[in-house]
């Protein structure tokens, strides 16, 4: 006799306003009386719609939140398992039951906000800036909302960056522990002519982060010919174990570039008569604290002011 | 009594390969679900991977994904573990976990002795 | 993914003491939390399932309660077999299984 287990009931996908992140929900299956003692397992497979491949989970629970981009559609689909101890050895699954969440096609896709950029400066506070949409009217303005698990529900921003009395851009500080999680932004617009097509991003703070430069650059030589580079961390929030280096040196004509995760650097003289000696240095946070980041600007240059050459006196 | 024995552990160099085994006895291995944890020098307990009874369904830890592949020979009731692409960060002592219930994983009711694997230059 | 965090990290306790670890989930894991003891160069062995289900052969004086984000081993009375290393594990959800990062149980 082949042992069947039926899906779950009432499987959908649900928006709590939280800017893309979703709740996938559902009820448990009819189980028969032979399995009522059996624990159900639950697989759920998901994904944005233009996606090759689907995210696998599996749960006891009958809830499952992610995020996702709202630029686009969503699919999902669950099926119940019977673990094998109860089935005799044999693995038992239920057919798939699918879902989807629609996105509002309210508003052409012209009007939604063009080259949304977000840099998290100095780990301190974030900036994002955007440009009106390709066909908009003279009265459009846009509004950006953002959230992130910590907060009870989405916010708005309030503090805009303003062309013309329009909003082009938000600046967001006092984010409490809002790095290492996703951090969802939607920007939307209203105009009275037209409606206004919503614009979702998704990332997580700590892999936009552009520091400040490095600063206190200091150079000397030992021997004639040992350089010894170094430079302090900038202030702020970063921790020091953060940072990579990359560094310009210069010998009169000829420069050439090197990297660290140190805060010095020793080097020889390429020639022990260069008059000129010369470097600059930027950072970024490193691999170990964040998956990306933006390098610093430039520091200042710092030249080695000292003795130049054997028959300098 | 039910024993899981690993084996295949050794020193690899960075990029190499190795292929552990567990061989298991003492139930119905084709029954219950199994899984690999890991446990680098003095640090906590780090689950890498599981597989469903009849091998149909492999589970995988971000940080392994891609380069280790679990299966399982329930006619020679054995779990294995090939590792590619290994890096220094995979040294640990690997143990196999038999799952307690549960179709993909669950608590485990019992572990081998492990197998030691070493990457270094 | 649901994170487990333990404390304390380091319990020091004499034999006879009641001794409580906490382990919370980052999201509600309903009761599928285990409890593992481990000893130096040893593989973990399985003290409570379920939350709440004692393992068989595991010594009365162990137990576990709580539900949903958080859950206690007990420990009525230390013996000096007790001396180890103890991890809750979730499996309510997964990929990936995740351990809490462990309480070191040593004599005071």
């Known amino acids: 006799l082949e042992i069947k287990v039926n899906p779950p009931q009432d499987f959908e996908i649900l928006d709590p306003g939280l800017l893309g992140y979703l709740y996938l929900q559902w009820k448990p299956p009819v189980v028969i009386e032979k399995f009522k003692g059996c624990t159900l397992e639950y697989e759920l497979k998901y994904r944005n719609v233009d996606s090759d491949s689907w995210k696998t989970i599996i749960t006891r629970n009958l809830i499952y939140k992610d995020g996702f981009d709202l630029n686009k559609g969503i699919e999902g689909k669950i099926r119940t398992h019977l673990s094998e101890h109860c089935t005799n050895g044999s693995e038992v699954q239920s057919p798939w039951i699918e879902a989807s969440y629609g996105i509002s096609d309210e508003g052409s896709l012209e009007t939604k906000i063009q080259d949304m950029k977000c840099i998290y400066y100095n780990w301190q506070y974030l900036v994002c800036s955007w440009k009106p949409g390709k066909t908009v009217y003279s009265d459009t303005n846009y509004t950006m909302f953002f959230w992130y698990e910590g907060l009870d529900h989405a916010l708005q921003c309030a503090d805009y960056l303003q062309h013309d009395e329009k909003n082009v851009g938000c600046k967001l500080s006092n984010l409490d522990s809002s790095d290492y999680k996703d951090f969802f932004i939607c920007v939307n617009g209203s105009s009275k002519l037209e409606p206004i097509r919503s614009s979702y991003t998704v990332f997580q703070l700590q892999n936009i982060v552009k520091p400040l430069p490095p600063e206190f650059l200091h150079i000397s030589v030992e021997n004639s010919i040992d350089i010894r580079m170094k430079w302090s961390t900038p202030g702020g929030p970063i921790p020091p174990r953060c940072y990579t280096y990359e560094i310009v040196i210069r010998e009169d004509d000829i420069s050439w570039e090197s990297a660290t995760d140190k805060n010095d650097m020793k080097l020889k003289r390429r020639a022990n008569e260069s008059e000129d000696l010369c470097f600059f240095v930027r950072c970024k946070v490193n691999i170990y604290c964040a998956d990306d980041g933006i390098w610093s600007e430039w520091s200042e240059e710092e030249c080695w002011e000292g003795y130049t050459g054997p028959d300098s006196k | 009594e039910v024993q899981l024995l690993e084996s295949g552990g050794g020193l690899v160099q960075p990029g190499g390969s190795l292929r552990l085994s567990c061989a298991a006895s003492g139930f119905t291995f084709s029954s219950y679900a199994m899984s690999w944890v890991r446990q680098a020098p003095g640090k906590g307990l780090e689950w890498v991977s599981a597989?469903?009874?009849?091998?149909?369904?492999?589970y995988y830890a971000d940080s392994v994904k891609g380069r280790f592949t679990i299966s399982r020979d329930n006619s020679k009731n054995t779990l294995y573990l090939q590792m590619n692409s290994l890096r220094a960060e995979d040294t640990a002592v690997y143990y196999c976990a038999k799952v307690r219930y549960g179709w993909g994983a669950g608590a485990f009711d019992y572990w081998g002795q492990g197998t030691l694997v070493t990457v270094s230059s | 993914d649901i994170q487990m965090t333990q404390s304390p990290s380091t319990l020091s306790a004499s034999v006879g003491d009641r001794v409580t670890i906490t382990c919370r989930a980052s999201?509600?894991?309903?009761?599928?939390l285990a409890w593992y003891q481990q000893k130096p160069g040893k593989a973990p062995k399985l003290l409570i399932y379920d939350a709440s289900s004692l393992e068989s052969g595991v010594p009365s004086r162990f137990s576990g309660s709580g539900s949903g984000t958080e859950f206690t081993l007990t420990i009525s009375s230390l013996q000096p077999d007790d001396f180890a290393t103890y991890y809750c594990?979730?499996?309510?959800?997964?990929?990936?299984?995740?351990f809490g990062q462990g309480t070191k149980v040593e004599i005071k």
């Open positions: 597989i469903s009874g009849s091998g149909g369904s492999t």
């Open positions: 999201q509600s894991i309903s009761s599928w």
């Open positions: 594990q979730q499996y309510d959800t997964y990929p990936p299984i995740t």
